[in-house]
Interface confidence: low
Amino acid sequence: HTAAQDNCTCPTNKMTVCSPDGPGGRCQCRALGSGMAVDCSTLTSKCLLLKARMSAPKNARTLVRPSEHALVDNDGLYDPDCDPEGRFKARQCNQTSVCWCVNSVGVRRTDKGDLSLRCDELVRTHHILIDLRHRPTAGAFNHSDLDAELRRLFRERYRLHPKFVAAVHYEQPTIQIELRQNTSQKAAGDVDIGDAAYYFERDIKGESLFQGRGGLDLRVRGEPLQVERTLIYYLDEIPPKFSMKRLT
């Protein structure tokens, strides 16, 4: 029988190939690019999603000021190396043997070097600041309604436990969502803030990773919340190591 007949699809990751070849004929899904089996009951790791994406055919006052150590993903897409659990390997290299160290969300945190570059450990990103600018509306959104809706979204769509949504700041038209998750806070089964932020980022861009679901329809008290710009800052448990030349 075919996978489709068994409704064998991955609801949380459309960048998979699924077939009923798991134990006892159960549906098993593998990520494109890596071929790794994924757990479709939760979000797929950002590393596996980036790998799958690269394998696909080419086609103010209350606002938080990101610290001097905040990283922004300026390097964009690359084909990452993922470990057997789907996490980013601490050291990433390209085909021309240029290497660099990344954090747990895959963002470069050192200068680029050669194959002799050492990255001793995968440094955890424990604080993510999602900075959104919404399109003009008739009036400002009610802060508490906006806060509740964004917390609901992260809980219900991305299955991120509410304790990891540290704060929602609003100063029209800027919205900031703070996600915090220390290594010690993250229990087995908990969604990683980096994965939730990545799914959210893709949703905001109209590139939902969910299978068959419509795009993200964000509304606050019925009023559509349309985002026109997104910036994401990543703060690591250990500050990044860049040369002074890059910082000036």
């Epitope: 009951s41 229990a187 089964g189």
Partner: antibody, heavy 121, light 107 residues
Framework: QVQLVQSGAEVKKPGASVKVSCKAS????????MQWVRQAPGQGLEWMGW????????KYAEDFHGRVTISADTSTSTAYLQLSSLKSEDTAVYYC??????????????WGQGTLVTVSS | DIQMTQSPSSLSASVGDRVTITCKAS??????VAWYQQKPGKAPKLLIY???YRYTGVPSRFSGSGSGTDFTLTISSLQPEDFAVYYC?????????FGQGTKLEIK
């Protein structure tokens, strides 16, 4: 909206088996666990076990081991509880309830309406 | 198994009262405690999960607190529809266990 609809009331004789169904709708069945809880008349709530609907792996409370089987049919989004070797003390309302997969999420956010199972000779 | 002990087992109160129900776990369950409301002949309804998180649609008069072994459900101003039985549940480890219930009655 999210709903769990259970099968109707059952009357069984001691020693018999009963199978209660719980049909889910309004969400993707394999993205949530299904728990089973029972409540004897005038008593409190007792957890019986749950099934990870994605992996198909069940886990049972020790008190019911060997007598209970929890299963799921993903093609119909239905979970089942089968209890064998029924005794009069098994007379209760049996509930299915939705949960997450990890321990942080083993609370029950949606419940079925309950199925009364009466065991009487 | 983790025992969940609720107190009081029954409680009489009036509309507008502030009511507190406590739940004690026999061992540390971190913040993995949920609270449910059950009315006669109906399935329980989730009020609070992870000790202090109010479930979607639950009125703000319901609040939860606690961690470790001691937990509290507070109803800040009782409404007529709040008279029911309340259960705590630990969702820390299997077997999942419930308190014996607290019956909240009209005085």
């Amino acid at each position: 909206q999210v709903q769990l609809v259970q099968s109707g009331a059952e009357v069984k004789k001691p020693g018999a088996s009963v199978k209660v169904s719980c049909k889910a709708s309004g969400y993707t069945f394999t993205t949530a666990g299904m728990q089973w809880v029972r409540q004897a008349p005038g008593q409190g709530l007792e957890w019986m076990g749950w099934i990870n609907t994605h992996s198909g792996v069940p886990k049972y409370a020790e008190d019911f081991h060997g007598r209970v089987t929890i299963s799921a049919d993903t093609s119909t989004s239905t979970a089942y509880l089968q209890l064998s070797s029924l005794k009069s003390e098994d007379t209760a309302v049996y509930y299915c309830a939705r949960s997450g997969f990890g321990s942080s999420y083993w609370y029950f956010d949606v419940w079925g309406q309950g199925t009364l199972v009466t065991v009487s000779s | 198994d983790i025992q969940m002990t609720q107190s009081p087992s029954s409680l009489s109160a009036s509309v507008g009262d502030r009511v507190t129900i406590t739940c004690k776990a026999s061992q540390d369950v971190s913040t993995a405690v949920a609270w449910y409301q059950q009315k006669p002949g109906k399935a329980p309804k989730l009020l609070i999960y992870s000790a202090s998180y109010r479930y979607t649609g639950v009125p703000s008069r319901f609040s939860g607190s606690g961690s470790g072994t001691d937990f509290t459900l507070t109803i800040s101003s009782l409404q007529p529809e709040d008279f029911a039985v309340y259960y705590c549940q630990q969702h820390y480890i299997t077997p999942l266990t419930f308190g014996q219930g607290t019956k909240l009655e009209i005085k």
